[in-house]
Amino acid sequence: MKVLQEPTCVSDYMSISTCEWKMNGPTNCSTELRLLYQLVFLLSEAHTCIPENNGGAGCVCHLLMDDVVSADNYTLDLWAGQQLLWKGSFKPSEHVKPRAPGNLTVHTNVSDTLLLTWSNPYPPDNYLYNHLTYAVNIWSENDPADFRIYNVTYLEPSLRIAASTLKSGISYRARVRAWAQCYNTTWSEWSPSTKWHNSYREPFEQH
């Protein structure tokens, strides 16, 4: 039994880091493998993560962690029974994938304006809370070409757009994702999408 693709890990900078790897053949990850991880500080001890299957030869492990700080560094040991298959380390602050925003809502009752709001996925005491920026994706269910991205580079989790920038009388969907420039993070997953029917009054044309 050998590791084909070494574990790579990302942290949500809050409580969970996710490590994925591939074995050289079909593996029952949860019964055959264990990933031990230990924070490199005085008095810390190793914790065990039981991996799950992620495709035939793929494994994934969700490591429970405390609030993350930039100094945190973990040793990682991948074991198959008594055999050490791989040894490495992981600095969560250098491999951050933010949590996805939640509670995306489209408010259509504002005069000819669409107000999209969502929730910051972090509590106020988390470092990322004040460092997230967002991308909002809006697309038409009827027209695949009608697909747009709005970059929200301010901290407020909201976006206002004129309803008239979208076609009237058809349904749209929106979703949002986040990233943090300060840690050069990857993008989060997209939030669940929300749907609304876009309708607005055409401006009265004078001749």
């Epitope: 500080f41 005085l42 008095l43 810390s44 001890e45 914790h47 405390d66 930039s70 100094a71 945190d72």
Partner: antibody, heavy 117, light 112 residues
């Protein structure tokens, strides 16, 4: 929210014994090392002992080795400190604390041990 | 054992003014990853100690941003940018580099 509640302190004669307990809640107890720290009346803080999350590793300041024993019961979320051969100079408030990144992130309210004849 | 030495022993302060406490260790607490294994604690009158700063510079959750930690190696400083009445108490530094964990002797901060 981390909560630590010490108990078991009291008045004991020199040479006597006491067992201190610390009931933990608000966090996954078995994942954390725990420490005991004491403070003699009007004095500073003195680290006594620590124990790893699994209970397999214990650590003591030299002056307490052989007299004090730290232990834990993860099924009861409880930390213990057995105090033997007590002396007058062991009179102090004993605090339990949760360790994280080596430091003491969360303290109990303390329990007073008085050694006197 | 690592010896921690704090100064001053007592620090009378005026509310609204800054304050500074020094802590020196008998050996370096700097770690190669760029942080220092030093914590600061405050024990308010009649209360248990509480963590203020860990790993030299990281403020603990809920600690006001008027508290900051600095320094490296063997010389460390806790600064209070503007002292408030609720900041009175005894401040301790503690090294987390090796066991036994050792504390400084404490600095008593009191209002003038």
């Amino acid at each position: 929210e981390v909560q630590l509640v010490e108990s078991g302190g009291g008045l004991v004669q020199p040479g006597g014994s006491l067992r201190l307990s610390c009931a933990a809640s608000g966090f996954t107890f078995s994942r954390y090392a725990m420490s005991w720290v004491r403070q003699a009346p009007g004095k500073g803080l003195e680290w006594v002992s620590a124990i790893g999350g699994s209970g397999g590793h214990t650590y003591y300041a030299d002056s307490f080795k052989g007299r004090f024993t730290i232990s834990r019961d993860n099924s009861k979320n409880t930390l213990y400190l057995q105090l033997n051969s007590l002396r007058a100079e062991d009179t102090a408030v004993y605090y339990c604390a949760r360790n994280l990144r080596g430091g003491l992130h969360g303290w109990g309210q303390g329990t007073l041990v008085t050694v006197s004849s | 054992d690592i010896v921690m030495t704090q100064s001053p022993l007592s620090l009378p302060v005026t509310p609204g003014e800054p304050a500074s406490i020094s802590c020196k260790s008998s050996q370096s607490l700097h770690h190669g990853q760029g942080y220092n294994r030093l914590d600061w604690y405050l024990q308010k009158p009649g209360q248990s100690p509480q963590l203020l700063i860990y790993l030299g510079t990281h403020r603990a959750s809920g600690v006001p941003d008027r508290f900051s930690g600095s320094g490296s190696g063997t010389d460390f400083t806790l600064k209070i940018s503007r002292v408030e009445a609720e900041d009175v108490g005894i401040y301790y530094c503690m090294q987390t580099h090796q066991t036994p964990l050792t504390f400084g002797g404490g600095t008593k901060v009191e209002i003038k």
